[in-house]
């Protein structure tokens, strides 16, 4: 089990990268002047207490920014939010902090991120550019849920 967050670069299959804009993550086409965020990824240390065969449970943070991705209900629908949180504080907790956890599944070069707190809901970007990251239950329709990860060292 990793004890240090792994920095990664994430883009979707349309080569859009994640950018922080007004405390919101949006997906934009990769261009010269675009400065994508580096994502920190760390496996949950309590993996044995979570569902098997669903993927690797991970926390996702914004490298160096003390912000982490989390899922919370807004009304009756789960939403993706950024919360001020140290990813290592989440990692060290005595139990999985499910609202901040995602099952990371890989198929070939494609990765999906399913909310642990809201099974069946995935991190997604709208097929149109410049849109915020969202949670969706609609796989492969109007939203893209497949992402590519590049490890940064």
């Amino acid at each position: 089990k990793s004890e240090m967050p792994q920095p990664v670069s994430i883009q979707d299959i349309n080569h859009r990268v994640w950018v922080l804009q007004d405390q919101i993550l949006i997906a934009v086409p990769r261009k010269d002047r675009v400065s994508p965020v580096t994502i920190s990824l760390i496996s949950c240390r309590h993996v044995e207490t979570l569902e098997k065969d669903r993927g690797n449970p991970i926390y996702l943070g914004l490298n160096g920014l003390n912000l982490c991705l989390m899922c919370a209900k807004a009304g009756d629908q789960p939403t993706l939010q950024l919360k001020e949180k140290d990813i290592m504080d989440l990692y060290n907790q005595p139990e999985p902090v499910k609202s901040f956890l995602f099952y990371h599944s890989q198929s070939g070069r494609n990765s999906t991120f399913e909310s642990v707190a809201f099974p069946g809901w995935f991190i997604a970007v709208s097929s149109e550019g410049g849109c915020p990251l969202i949670l969706t239950q609609e796989l492969g329709k109007a939203n893209t849920t497949d992402f590519g990860l590049t490890m940064l060292f």
Epitope: L50, Q93, P94, E95, P96, S99
Partner: antibody
Framework: QVQLVQSGAEVKKPGASVKVSCKAS????????IHWVRQAPGQGLEWIGR????????RYDPKFQGRATITTDTSTSTVYLEFSSLRSEDTAVYYC??????????????WGQGTLVTVSS | QAVVTQEPSLTVSPGGTVTLTCRSS?????????ANWVQEKPGQLFAGLIG???DRAPGVPARFSGSLLGGKAALTISGAQPEDEAIYFC?????????FGGGTKLTVL
């Protein structure tokens, strides 16, 4: 409001088993962890184990592994503790407690009223 | 397995300050033990006071504070009230299980 209501007192013979229930209301048990703790007469609290009701996974104190079984029925928001091969030293008040993440940390914030289990021949 | 020890009893005057401690037989208590403090008042349900060493649970008065003190977890009550008379239990996390202390009976006299 948040409540954990436990089943009533039990008297059991040595070697028997007992099953205590803890019914949650005022919150979704799938969003928390439910723990079982006991207190023998004149003693401190002793942690037995916990369940993640959303998934059903459990953890136990090594001392109770094999004798304690924690289960859940999410349809009725109820968590159960079954304790087997009872001995006189298992006579205690058994409590369920919610371990809830709030802000930055987990808290044992709400507790049941306790269930007295007496083991006597 | 670690044994967690608390003072069996303490007395504080109304308005006074008292510190309850929680010691681990396995060495110094650290933030990684995520100390919790729970209050048991006569005829009432247990109630969580502190989590993660020093975080107050929602609704807990500011006179209750948690800290680390000389290698032990500590609960300080500043300006003790008569209603603070209770038994206080600490719980420490050890990698994959919790261990509770024996409790401290606090008298406000």
């Amino acid at each position: 409001q948040v409540q954990l209501v436990q089943s009533g007192a039990e008297v059991k013979k040595p070697g028997a088993s007992v099953k205590v229930s803890c019914k949650a209301s005022g919150f979704n048990i799938k969003d928390t962890y439910i723990h079982w703790v006991r207190q023998a007469p004149g003693q401190g609290l002793e942690w037995i184990g916990r369940i993640d009701p959303a998934i059903g996974t459990t953890r136990y104190d090594p001392k109770f592994q094999g004798r304690a079984t924690i289960t859940t029925d999410t349809s009725t928001s109820t968590v159960y503790l079954e304790f087997s091969s009872l001995r006189s030293e298992d006579t205690a008040v058994y409590y369920c407690a919610r371990l809830h993440y709030f802000g930055n940390n987990f808290f044992f914030d709400y507790w049941g009223q306790g269930t007295l289990v007496t083991v006597s021949s | 397995q670690a044994v967690v020890t608390q003072e069996p009893s303490l007395t504080v005057s109304p308005g006074g300050t008292v510190t309850l401690t929680c010691r681990s037989s396995s060495g110094a208590v650290t933030t990684s033990n995520y100390a919790n403090w729970v209050q048991e008042k006569p005829g009432q349900l247990f109630a969580g006071l502190i989590g993660g060493t020093n975080d107050r649970a929602p609704g807990v008065p500011a006179r209750f504070s948690g800290s680390l003190l000389g290698g032990k977890a500590a609960l300080t009550i500043s300006g003790a009230q008569p209603e603070d008379e209770a038994i206080y239990f600490c719980a420490l996390w050890f990698s994959n299980h919790w261990v509770f202390g024996g409790g401290t009976k606090l008298t406000v006299l």
